[in-house]
Each structure stands twice: as C-alpha cells, then as structure tokens.
C-alpha cells in the first residue's frame, strides 16, 4: 500500500545526519554559502545555495536529494528571494541549520 511522504523526508534527514556525524576536516574545506529563510520553498532555496559548492563529494548526495523536492531546475549562480543575500555561513553550519529545521517539520508532520 501507499507509504506516507515521511519516509522520503527521513532519508534526507538521515543523509544530513551522516554528513554532520562523519565530519572530520572542515566540511567542503570551509566553503561559504548564502544563508536562506527556512520557510516555504526552502528546498529550492537550499539547493540554490548548495549548488554553488563544487568539488565537495560529501554533499553531492544531499544536492541530488534536494532536487527531488524542488519542482524546477536549479543551476549554479541562480538565486531566489528566499536567500538572505547579506549573510554567508559555512556549509557545515548551513547543513546543521537545515537538519534542525527538517527534524522540526518531521516532528510536526509537515512533509510537503
């Protein structure tokens, strides 16, 4: 029978957990990305921010997973109004913030 969308969100959460737990050296060599508003449309915004990080295998799967939650194609250099364009943070902090928010959504049953 059908399975609730929660399982897909759980996969994304588990991938972010893996990244934070397996972090030894600075994630993505300490690359900086634009901070985003964790509101509606955040999946596309998160992808738009992370897509600008290249050569970082640790977040490749996350980038691909996020694409499955964003209806449009996202390319490097593409930005939406959901970015806090005056604030850049390290990828590691970005991942932690996103993880905390997704866990909150998961607990509240907000899967869409």
């Amino acid at each position: 029978g059908p399975v609730p969308p929660s399982t897909a969100l759980r996969e994304l959460i588990e991938e972010l957990v893996n990244i934070t737990q397996n972090q030894k050296a600075p994630l993505c060599n300490g690359s900086m990305v634009w901070s985003i508003n964790l509101t509606a449309g955040m999946y596309c915004a998160a992808l738009e921010s992370l897509i600008n990080v290249s050569g970082c295998s640790a977040i490749e799967k996350t980038q691909r997973m996020l694409s499955g939650f964003c209806p449009h194609k996202v390319s490097a250099g593409q930005f939406s109004s959901l970015h806090v364009r005056d604030t850049k943070i390290e990828v590691a902090q970005f991942v932690k913030d996103l993880l905390l928010h997704l866990k909150k959504l998961f607990r509240e049953g907000q899967f869409n």
């Epitope: 059908p2 399975v3 969308p5 399982t7 897909a8 759980r10 996969e11 994304l12 980038q63 691909r64 997973m65 694409s67 499955g68 939650f69 964003c70 209806p71 194609k73 390319s75 869409n112």
Partner: antibody, heavy 123, light 106 residues
C-alpha cells in the same frame, strides 16, 4: 549494497500476459520512486513506467498505456509490472531501475539498474 | 511527444576528445542525464544534472546543457569508453531517452 533483481520474463504468445517482479535490497525501498525501462534487441533504451515513492502516482509511456500496470509492495520491497495484451514489439530486456526521492523524483537520476529480464512475444 | 536526437555514431582515436550531442526543444530548461551501456551490460549513469559525475565515474567524462543541446564530452578517450551512450530528460510526466550514440575508439 543496493541491488535490484528482476524475474518473470519468458516466452509468451501475442495477446498473452506476463508479470515481471523486481526484488530490491540495500536501501529504503518505500522512499524511492522506481521505474521500468526496456530495450528491444539491437535497439535503444525506452522508458516504460514509473511509480513514485512520494505518493501513489504512476506514469506510463504512451506505447504501453492501458496495457501495462505498474505496482509495488513496500512490505516486500518488490516492484511489479503486469503486462497484458502483449505484442511482438514488446519483445525486449526489461530493466528495473531505482529512481529518486520526493515529489520530483525525476530530477535525481536513475542511479541503480538491475541486470534485466528478457520478454519474448512470439507465436 | 518530446524527442531527443543524437548522432548514431561517433569515432575517436585513443587519447582524443569525443563529443556527443543531444538535441531537444528547450532542453537547457531541463536537467539532462547521460548513460553509458556496454554490450551485454546494464546502463550506467555517467552524468546527472547536466554536468555532475556520480562517484566512481572518471573525470574525463563531462557534460553541459544550454539552449536546445546537451553535450557529453569524453576527454582523453580510452578503449574502455567504447560503448553506446544515451541522453535522458523528463518532459510532460514521461522520461525520454535519446536515440543513442555508438562511440567507437579507433
């Protein structure tokens, strides 16, 4: 390790039916969309059908719409393809493929393919 | 229905560069994917999201996508790269595969 194992192929007469199965392991099957892709002898790849892992949405190529039915049993980690009213042009190797996550699973990329099962439609 | 067109064959000498094109209406607005298939084997994803390589795919494989054309480039082509290559995209609730290109390493 992610693995997909197809079964159920064989020889069937035109107008006949066949049900293909795909046993999945090594990943959370229920989370991912799954597809069937076929390849006729000496020909290119042709997508047949997909089943979302986000909801119960199913998708079909025009060439099989109304004849083929995709389904899945998440408790058994198994994907199915029920093929009815088979034609000679359905003769092909049928691959089971792991698709992506989320409502827009098609943005992810077909990462993992099974070895395929051969369907021959002939009298 | 949406169509993706590829050249039937491309020949390349070892060490040289092979380029395979995939043409479709406004393809650049969609994600493009590339698969490699060797005789008797299942297809393998070599490029996703236009230009990204899955882990384990050699750096000599690269991709681009803009306008109506996606391109797969194999730099420093090796004998082991001889295979059929297919592009793929999603349009109107269906996956579409390209017509396929046979790459021959002379």
């Amino acid at each position: 390790e992610v693995q997909l194992l197809e079964s159920g192929g064989g020889l069937v007469q035109p107008g006949g039916s066949l049900r293909l199965s795909c046993a999945a392991s090594g990943f959370t099957f229920s989370s991912y969309a799954m597809s069937w892709v076929r390849q006729a002898p000496g020909k290119g790849l042709e997508w047949v059908s997909a089943f979302s892992g986000w909801d119960v949405s199913t998708y079909y190529a025009d060439s099989v719409k109304g004849r083929f039915t995709i389904s899945r049993d998440n408790s058994k980690n198994t994907l199915y393809l029920q093929m009815n009213s088979l034609r000679a042009e359905d003769t092909a190797v049928y691959y089971c493929v792991q698709d992506g996550l989320g409502p827009y699973f098609y943005n992810y990329g077909m990462d993992v393919w099974g070895q395929g099962t051969t369907v021959t439609v002939s009298s | 229905s949406y169509e993706l067109t590829q050249p039937p064959s491309v020949s390349v000498s070892p060490g040289q560069t092979a380029s395979i094109t995939c043409s479709g209406d406004k393809l650049g607005d969609k994600y493009s994917f590339w698969f490699q298939q060797k005789p008797g084997q299942s297809p393998v994803l070599v490029i996703y999201h236009d230009s990204k390589r899955p882990s384990g795919i050699p750096e000599r494989f690269s991709g681009s996508n803009s306008g109506d054309t996606a391109t797969l480039t194999i730099s420093g082509t090796q004998a082991m790269d001889e295979a059929d290559y297919y592009c793929q995209a999603w349009d109107s609730s269906t996956y579409v595969f390209g017509t396929g290109t046979k790459v021959t390493v002379l």
